[in-house]
Interface confidence: medium
């Protein structure tokens, strides 16, 4: 379990401010919703609504919140220790192997087929031979999850020092 | 909703160890800590060690060191508390916990008896 | 490893009282104090974190306070559901350790 964390993925370096809470780290180690100081001496929150960190963590930094693109609803928010969850708008998909838009589903199926499956955020329609019952070609498999982030966001441990 | 659920009472024979399981459903396991907190009889609460299953690291406290073992398997959202050499004293509830700091969800409780 | 000593080992107190539990650390802490609430046969629960900061859900009555060595945990009035054994626990350092409890009962 490893994530590559790119400079993107980084709030922008912030001082302590007053409302940010520090606790003293533990082996060197922060807690989820926390990141740590410069100096090694602190764990500092994360700003509700701005950034997050999801595990225990030597980041100097939490983790921006992703914002959902249009297109998009919003699942649940971003807060100190979860990412915000977006989800595609009704009508559109997630693909597998394009994760970074919505597509819109197909209206029907093509001629001599009937639909099996319903449109989802995370699959399109899904469409079968009438006779024989095999799957359309260009069926696009069911992701299991649905809960999406934006490219970079790790969804696995980060840890700076491995 | 975290769910920290842990295995049935035991009862044990001085100088044996005992084997405590605790499964999390219902969040991300790997991403806090798991501390096991004992409580004897009639007694406080005392933090015997943690293990932060990302990292796979355990620490300890003095007492127990030598004669506890946790350790996480990520793949069920298993943790497992090991004590050793038990004596009479080691009769106690042990409680896991999720742990960030402070412990906001604990376990149900084991009851380890240890008696000849 | 850090001593954390609670007094009074108990006490006795009405519905409707204020009751002021302390907790005394061997060396300075910092903020870095939890309290936690625990009733006979049930597991702890967590009341305050960080010296003073109230766990969702915890009613307003409990509040905390201090820094360094001394910590108090303040209940302004106390209600039924109230009595049981108050714990104070610090994270500064490994090992985390807990005070011996302080239980509050029915005057």
């Known amino acids: 379990e490893s994530a590559l964390i790119t400079q993107q993925d980084l709030a922008p370096q912030q001082r302590a401010a007053p409302q940010q809470k520090r606790s003293s780290p533990s082996e060197g180690l922060c807690p989820p919703g926390h990141h740590i100081s410069e100096d090694g001496r602190d764990c500092i929150s994360c700003k509700y609504g701005q950034d997050y960190s999801t595990h225990w963590n030597d980041l100097l930094f939490c983790l921006r919140c992703t914002r959902c693109d249009s297109g998009e609803v919003e699942l649940s928010p971003c807060t100190t220790t979860r990412n915000t969850v977006c989800q595609c708008e009704e009508g559109t998909f997630r693909e597998e192997d394009s994760p970074e838009m919505c597509r819109k589903c197909r209206t029907g199926c093509p001629r001599g087929m009937v639909k099996v499956g319903d449109c989802t955020p995370w699959s399109d329609i899904e469409c079968v031979h009438k006779e024989s019952g095999t799957k359309h070609s260009g069926e696009v498999p069911a992701v299991e999850e649905t809960v999406t982030s934006s490219p970079g966001t790790p969804a696995s441990p980060c840890s700076l020092s491995g | 909703q975290v769910q920290l659920v842990q295995s049935g009472a035991e009862v044990k024979k001085p100088g044996s160890s005992v084997k405590v399981s605790c499964k999390a459903s219902?969040?991300?396991?790997?991403?806090?800590?798991i501390s096991w907190v004992r409580q004897a009889p009639g007694q406080g609460l005392e933090w015997m060690g943690r293990i932060i299953p990302i990292f796979g690291t355990a620490n300890y406290a003095q007492k127990f060191q030598g004669r506890v073992t946790i350790t996480a398997d990520k793949s069920t959202s298993t943790a497992y508390m090991e004590l050793s050499s038990l004596r009479s004293e080691d009769t106690a509830v042990y409680y896991c916990a999720r742990e960030g700091f402070y412990i906001d969800y604990w376990g149900q409780g084991t009851t380890v008896t240890v008696s000849s | 490893d850090i001593q954390m000593t609670q007094s009074p080992s108990s006490l006795s107190a009405s519905v409707g009282d204020r009751v002021t539990i302390t907790c005394s650390a061997s060396?300075?802490?910092?903020?870095?104090l939890n309290w936690y609430q625990q009733k006979p046969g049930k597991a702890p629960k967590l009341l305050i974190y960080?010296?003073?900061s109230l766990h969702s859900g915890v009613p307003s009555r409990f509040s905390g306070s201090g820094s360094g060595t001394d910590f108090t945990l303040t209940i302004s009035s106390l209600q039924p559901e109230d009595f049981a054994t108050y714990y104070c626990q610090q994270y500064s350092k490994l090992p985390w350790t807990f005070g011996q409890g302080t239980k509050v009962e029915i005057k």
């Open positions: 960080y010296t003073s």
């Open positions: 060396q300075g802490i910092r903020n870095y």
């Open positions: 219902g969040g991300t396991f790997s991403s806090y800590a």
